[in-house]
Amino acid sequence: APVRSLNCTLRDSQQKSLVMSGPYELKALHLQGQDMEQQVVFSMSFVQGEESNDKIPVALGLKEKNLYLSCVLKDDKPTLQLESVDPKNYPKKKMEKRFVFNKIEINNKLEFESAQFPNWYISTSQAENMPVFLGGTKGGQDITDFTMQFVSS
């Protein structure tokens, strides 16, 4: 059975939008006006994952691209990357764990915790134009809270 997905954009809690920075990286920066069209549109898929009270397992693909955010170890550190997949096989209900994020939503603020690396979150820097990354701290300098905007399919 096909997995259910919704198209959306994400902005961090400082209202920075996410845009492509090269073929396999996202960066966060403030956009306005027509520049808003640069922001990436995600296809958020609702996938299978471990049972948890307040966490919803999702995968975050780039709309109409065969790229998914994934979490892997690089130099022994959990790292966020954009990974290319075979579009014939993705998205699917049972995504590999590296593609799965636990969406935690409180008062319309979203966090995305790596299922592969608990307590590591999709993060942005306070600074402008910096890469989106996987961060191991919450509530510090780096930003782990996002808002979501629906996009028409």
């Epitope: 059975a1 259910r4 919704l6 198209n7 959306c8 609702f46 299978q48 049972e51 919803i56 999702v58 209900k93 969406k103 939503e105 319309n108 629906f150 996009v151 028409s152 399919s153």
Partner: antibody
């Protein structure tokens, strides 16, 4: 107060159409699917389709495809279900219900129901 | 479409009895299962979502369990206000489907 309020009962002739409304209040209309479910007299529940007002995504039960149209008006927080080519078997109570966009909480709030009677 | 069977279709029980209702599916429906209560002439009322999570305000005598294809609603000690019809629903795959219902009657 969080609620879904549906339009009143309708009596329709076979072959005609009916449009049932479902007005939401007390929550963010955009972020919840509005589900449409019907229940024929003395029968069980049957899912007809859904709409997510925030994105415009719509999913229909194939059984009703071509006969049912689901829409939403974000400005009034109202969803609509129109059923055409009515026949006597469409006599039922039609319910709207809501479900969060991520499907987490199931059909957690229901309208009071709208009785549609199809009779010549 | 996912095939489903809810059983029993009806049962007679007394106040204080433990009541169990089951829903079986033709394929894995992950966590997307809810249970409802419906009284005559009224809209359904949600009791349990995501298999086992109790809706706010629903008494703790109601509980849900199961995984994969087999799911259960249990009422640990039936109360007078629990005499009603109960339905399961899967919302894992289109078309979403409701069980045929279980009418709980007074013995």
């Amino acid at each position: 107060q969080v609620q879904l309020v549906q339009s009143g009962a309708e009596v329709k002739k076979p072959g005609s159409s009916v449009k049932v409304s479902c007005k939401a209040s007390g929550y963010t209309f955009d972020r919840y699917w509005i589900e449409w479910v019907r229940q024929a007299p003395g029968q069980g529940l049957e899912w007809m389709g859904e709409i997510l007002p925030g994105s415009g995504d719509i999913n229909y039960n194939e059984k009703f495809k071509g006969r049912v149209t689901i829409t939403a008006d974000k400005s009034t927080s109202t969803a609509y279900m129109e059923l055409s080519s009515l026949r006597s078997e469409d006599t039922a109570v039609y319910y709207c219900a809501r479900m969060y966009y991520d499907y987490d909480q199931g059909f957690d709030l229901w309208g009071q129901g709208t009785l549609v009677t199809v009779s010549s | 479409d996912i095939q489903m069977t809810q059983s029993p279709s009806s049962l007679s029980a007394s106040v204080g009895d433990r009541v169990t209702i089951t829903c079986k599916f033709s394929q894995d429906i992950d966590r997307f299962l809810s249970w409802f209560q419906q009284k005559p002439g009224k809209a359904p009322k949600s009791l349990i979502y995501r298999v086992k999570r109790l809706v706010d305000g629903v008494p703790s005598r109601f509980s849900g369990s199961g995984s994969g294809t087999d799911f259960t609603l249990t009422i640990s000690s039936l109360q007078p206000e629990d005499f009603a019809t109960y339905y399961c629903v899967q919302y894992d795959e289109f078309p979403y489907g409701f069980g045929g219902g279980t009418k709980v009657e007074i013995k």
